[in-house]
């Protein structure tokens, strides 16, 4: 039994190492955002015993704008550091709980399905505002991500359900 792709969370990305039951994955707030204090980036693939269907738990994560980064220009993309994701000091304790992040609060919400990200409507003659955001999924090719502002994603061929051949970059883990 495996989980489908996890829900998208506004202003956050996710790298899924495994879709297996009881797998735990973390969302990472996008560049320019940080985890709101008291919210958790963790999601777990669990089984609904009533329906025998696996699903990801809903993370309480809220990614809020990081005032410290408001006036900084994002780093130009490169093959090593693309997104400039700000690492959050968030780790799992043996109990499975994570420490609260020491960040100011705000009211960004996590979407229950695909996140609706603020952005301008595209018109052929207009340039909308920036504001990079994304969503992701699974069932792709396989690989090892590369280093960004935090540490490398630790992924081996056996650790993921992705078919061989695809490599992520520009993403940082926050375990």
């Amino acid at each position: 039994i495996t989980c489908p792709p996890p829900m998208s969370v506004e202003h956050a990305d996710i790298w899924v190492k495994s879709y297996s039951l009881y797998s735990r994955e973390r969302y990472i707030c996008n560049s320019g955002f940080k985890r709101k204090a008291g919210t958790s980036s963790l999601t777990e693939c669990v089984l609904n015993k009533a329906t025998n269907v696996a699903h990801w738990t809903t993370p309480s994560l809220k990614c809020i704008r990081d005032p410290a980064l408001v006036h900084q220009r994002p780093a130009p993309p490169s093959t090593v550091t693309t997104a400039g994701v700000t690492p959050q000091p968030e780790s799992l304790s043996p109990s499975g709980k994570e420490p609260a992040a020491s960040s100011p609060s705000s009211n960004n919400t996590a979407a229950t399905t695909a996140a609706i990200v603020p952005g301008s409507q595209l018109m052929p003659s207009k340039s909308p505002s920036t504001g990079t955001t994304e969503i992701s999924s699974h069932e792709s090719s396989h690989g090892t991500p590369s280093q960004t502002t935090a540490k490398n994603w630790e992924l081996t061929a056996s650790a993921s359900h992705q078919p061989p051949g695809v490599y992520p970059q520009g993403h940082s883990d926050t375990t």
């Epitope: 792709p5 998208s8 969370v9 969302y27 595209l122 052929p124 969503i135 992701s136 999924s137 992520p168």
Partner: nanobody
């Protein structure tokens, strides 16, 4: 509805470089993950690279270290910089937009993409 228009394809010698562009209109560009796929004659369409709404990137093993995907939400454009091209890179290259899974870095099935461009041909001669 999002319209995607690719450009930048052409004929290049092995070892050369090309930069493909994909211009989007008709939707909220920053709400999509963008991907590049390619299809050689007689072969299935295959994943090349993906950039999430958070600008995180993901590459097929066959292009890792040679191709770079990037996006500019202000210009509603995604690029694919292709260096050290090989004859086996010859294919029609397609740009695609994925809204539902815009924040998923390593999710690349063709079925997750909502919109596709018409493609641009890249031919690498030996």
């Amino acid at each position: 509805e999002v319209q995607l228009v690719e450009s930048g394809g052409g004929l290049v010698q092995a070892g050369g470089s090309l930069r493909l562009s994909c211009a989007a209109s008709g939707g909220t560009f920053s709400s999509y993950a963008m991907g590049w796929f390619r299809q050689a004659p007689g072969k299935e369409r295959e994943f090349v690279a993906r950039v999430t709404w958070g600008a995180n990137t993901y590459y097929a093993e066959s292009v890792k270290g040679r191709f770079t995907i990037s996006r500019d939400n202000a210009k509603n454009t995604v690029w694919l910089q292709m260096n050290s091209l090989k004859p086996e890179d010859t294919a029609a290259y397609y740009c695609a937009a994925d809204r539902k899974y815009a924040g998923h870095i390593n999710y690349t099935p063709l079925t997750s993409y909502d919109y596709w461009g018409q493609g641009t041909q890249v031919t690498v001669s030996s």
